[in-house]
Amino acid sequence: HTAAQDNCTCPTNKMTVCSPDGPGGRCQCRALGSGMAVDCSTLTSKCLLLKARMSAPKNARTLVRPSEHALVDNDGLYDPDCDPEGRFKARQCNQTSVCWCVNSVGVRRTDKGDLSLRCDELVRTHHILIDLRHRPTAGAFNHSDLDAELRRLFRERYRLHPKFVAAVHYEQPTIQIELRQNTSQKAAGDVDIGDAAYYFERDIKGESLFQGRGGLDLRVRGEPLQVERTLIYYLDEIPPKFSMKRLTA
């Protein structure tokens, strides 16, 4: 796997341990927590990143669930089970044998149960809505400039194919970025929208996963964009299955 050869680090994932023990003395990097080899030329999967994060725990921040089918990561951090490809396993359990089903971004999509709970497949999150509120600026951002800057960001920083950025909406002070990626659209080597959204979320929170970088500070035509709050909504190809009690709570 590629990494910075000179000092053997992983540019796309600072939560790794790297050493020149790959084939021919090449730099190889393994994710903290799981020990899995990662490809440093692209984003690391969210599952491996969460696992690495749990090896150095921090306080979880939580978001708000706005509607019946849109999921938000209300449960915060947990130590996930990842498959050999680094994807979330459909069923996740904690150390007290409480289990639940998750989607492809690792967000719980069923009520919690016991070890008998079955999760037949990993349901894909095909639509992600990133909702940002920015602080007052010198004036409203020009919509097309904002659109271009955010598309550039996802293309260059997160290596997400432009076709997966479905839309950028703007009604001052709210910015919405829509990411869409169906199972059939995602080719081998394509960055997953869930991974791109997670890197973006961590960047906005000033916890960049990239090696040697601080948080992400955006500017549009020179104008500083200071984010006041971020909410991320996840929509799955199959609607989540929660009891009526949860839906009316």
Epitope: R135, T137, A138, G139, I204, K205, G206, E207, S208, R213, G214, G215, D217, R219, R221, G222, E223, P224, Q226, E228
Partner: antibody, heavy 119, light 106 residues
Framework: QVQLVQSGAEVKKPGASVKVSCKAS????????IHWVRQAPGQRLEWMGY????????KYNEKFKGKATLTSDKSSTTAYMEVRGLTSEDSAVYYC????????????WGQGTLVTVSS | DIQMTQSPSSLSASVGDRVTITCKAS??????LAWYQQKPGKAPKLLLY???SLETGVPSRFSGSGSGTDYTLTISSLQPEDFATYYC????????FGQGTKVEIK
């Protein structure tokens, strides 16, 4: 290399106005805002506001709204800060500064302009 | 407005000492914190941004840490040219500075 060069020291009477200039060079002027920061003797640095030379949009610290006016001139790549109704409290060093290329911290600063208000 | 409180306001140290300055924000600033060094009659100089990222050309004896509301600047081995005043600055919600910490020769 990036440079911000400010106008010289000024001595003003109470009630007067002062206009400080900041000439930018070594980068594309419209790519970054220009911040203005004030430092009164023995005091902390105080952000006054910024101007975006791209569209002349301004954002001010509430404390300086109506007190300071920020302008810029693209043709001469110069930013200006005018303070009106000067009092002894406005005696300070005034700095212009440019943001860091990847954050909103300030990495290039002018040399500062000392404004003294005295009767 | 976000308030930034630095401590101590001044300290005396010798060359070779390890020096630690702390900065507390009145609310979470999500690592949007910069540290500056200022010498008498000079403009501030950016040392670190993003709480931990060292500005190009700044010696590695300077380091930053912290998260949430609490941040620290550490000078691992004080050098003669490090005697100055240090300011923290948040840039999460507009821009505000700490009151400064003067590092003097013991």
């Amino acid at each position: 290399q990036v440079q911000l060069v400010q106008s010289g020291a000024e001595v003003k009477k109470p009630g007067a106005s002062v206009k400080v200039s900041c000439k930018a060079s070594g980068y594309t002027f419209t790519t970054y805002v220009i911040h203005w920061v004030r430092q009164a003797p023995g005091q902390r640095l105080e952000w006054m506001g910024y101007i975006n030379p791209n569209n002349d949009g301004t954002k001010y610290n509430e404390k300086f709204k109506g007190k300071a006016t920020l302008t810029s001139d693209k043709s001469s790549t110069t930013a200006y800060m005018e303070v009106r109704g000067l009092t002894s409290e406005d005696s300070a060093v005034y700095y212009c500064a440019r943001p860091h290329f990847e954050t909103h911290a300030m990495d290039y600063w002018g040399q500062g302009t000392l404004v003294t208000v005295s009767s | 407005d976000i308030q930034m409180t630095q401590s101590p306001s001044s300290l005396s140290a010798s060359v070779g000492d390890r020096v630690t300055i702390t900065c507390k924000a009145s609310e979470d600033i999500f690592n949007r914190l910069a540290w500056y060094q200022q010498k008498p009659g000079k403009a501030p100089k950016l040392l670190l941004y993003g709480a931990t990222s060292l500005e190009t050309g700044v010696p590695s004896r300077f380091s930053g840490s912290g998260s949430g509301t609490d941040y620290t600047l550490t000078i691992s081995s004080l050098q003669p040219e490090d005697f100055a005043t240090y300011y923290c600055q948040q840039y999460w919600n507009t821009w505000t500075f700490g009151q400064g910490t003067k590092v003097e020769i013991k």
